[in-house]
């Protein structure tokens, strides 16, 4: 019979013969022959192959380097790579998450609009009129000024974006 020029899905052409690819999680040991099937071997510990393949070596799992602030989010298998994420209080510097940086804090006068996650930094916003923040924080929102009226007090010192109002007693009219 004529040697094939193309093979079926998940096969490859070698020496005028269609051989089966190795399934994910296995590497190629030897090509098929007229008499034998493709020989594949499972990847070793800490190795993987995530496609149908004819690779003779498996890939090493990604190392989540703690010195770069990384930790394992999902342990790799023979068919998948390890997924890294950042330690608590840190976030990835890129989408590929190859290293981490400390979450940004919002300065006094600014509050947290969105708390940081493992993949995104803190988003800060200026405290609007009627609100303040007197701390540098990665968690604190702007707080509303104290309402002196509800405490039967009067404003003695106006609030700013960094300080609360100061309330004091109302002046009593003497007879």
């Amino acid at each position: 019979p004529e040697p094939p020029t193309a093979c079926r899905e998940k096969q490859y052409l070698i020496n005028s013969q269609c051989c089966s690819l190795c399934q994910p999680g296995q590497k190629l040991v030897s090509d098929c022959t007229e008499f034998t099937e493709t020989e594949c071997l499972p990847c070793g510990e800490s190795e993987f192959l995530d496609t149908w393949n004819r690779e003779t070596h498996c890939h090493q799992h990604k190392y989540c380097d703690p010195n770069l602030g990384l930790r394992v989010q999902q342990k790799g298998t023979s068919e998948t790579d390890t997924i890294c994420t950042c330690e608590e209080g840190w976030h990835c510097t890129s989408e590929a998450c190859e290293s981490c940086v400390l979450h940004r804090s919002c300065s006094p006068g600014f509050g947290v609009k969105q708390i940081a996650t493992g993949v995104s930094d803190t988003i800060c916003e200026p405290c609007p009129v009627g609100f303040f923040s007197n701390v540098s924080s990665a968690f604190e929102k702007c707080h509303p000024w104290t309402s002196c009226e509800t405490k039967d007090l009067v404003v003695q010192q106006a609030g700013t974006n960094k300080t609360d109002v100061v309330c004091g007693p109302q002046d009593r009219l003497r007879a």
């Epitope: 995530d50 496609t51 149908w52 790579d81 989408e95």
Partner: nanobody, 126 residues
């Protein structure tokens, strides 16, 4: 949940060029491979090109090798397919696909992809 939105398709003369884009949202981009597939009327969906995240390794179908180029821009969460020297037989609906996290290698089979876009029509007139 992952959303993929293709754009850049259209009608072009044979020998012309188009650049397809696929914007990904709702996922952490840059940790898994992406690919392009196409389906012509009355034909099976076929692999076109793929790009992995380990060193940006690429794979191409023999029919497009040397004419098409796949690339990614992690900053804008987009994968591109630059198509040059287009032929009438390139006419098809082009769909982008993404593998799940932990699958960094460029893959050529449909069942190795986890998320799919709706597709964009490319028509090449002779």
């Amino acid at each position: 949940q992952v959303q993929l939105q293709e754009s850049g398709g259209g009608l072009v003369q044979a020998g012309g060029s188009l650049r397809l884009s696929c914007a990904a949202s709702g996922r952490t981009f840059g940790r898994s491979a992406m690919g392009w597939f196409r389906q012509a009327p009355g034909k099976e969906r076929e692999f076109v090109a793929a790009i992995g995240t380990r060193g940006g390794s690429t794979k191409y179908a023999d029919s497009v090798k040397g004419r098409f180029t796949i690339s990614t821009d992690n900053a804008s969460n987009t994968v591109y397919l630059q198509m040059d020297s287009l032929k009438p037989e390139d006419t098809a609906v082009y769909r982008c696909a993404v593998r799940g996290p932990g699958y960094p290698s460029a893959a050529i089979f449909q069942d190795e992809y986890h998320y799919w876009g709706q597709g964009t029509q490319v028509t090449v007139s002779s």
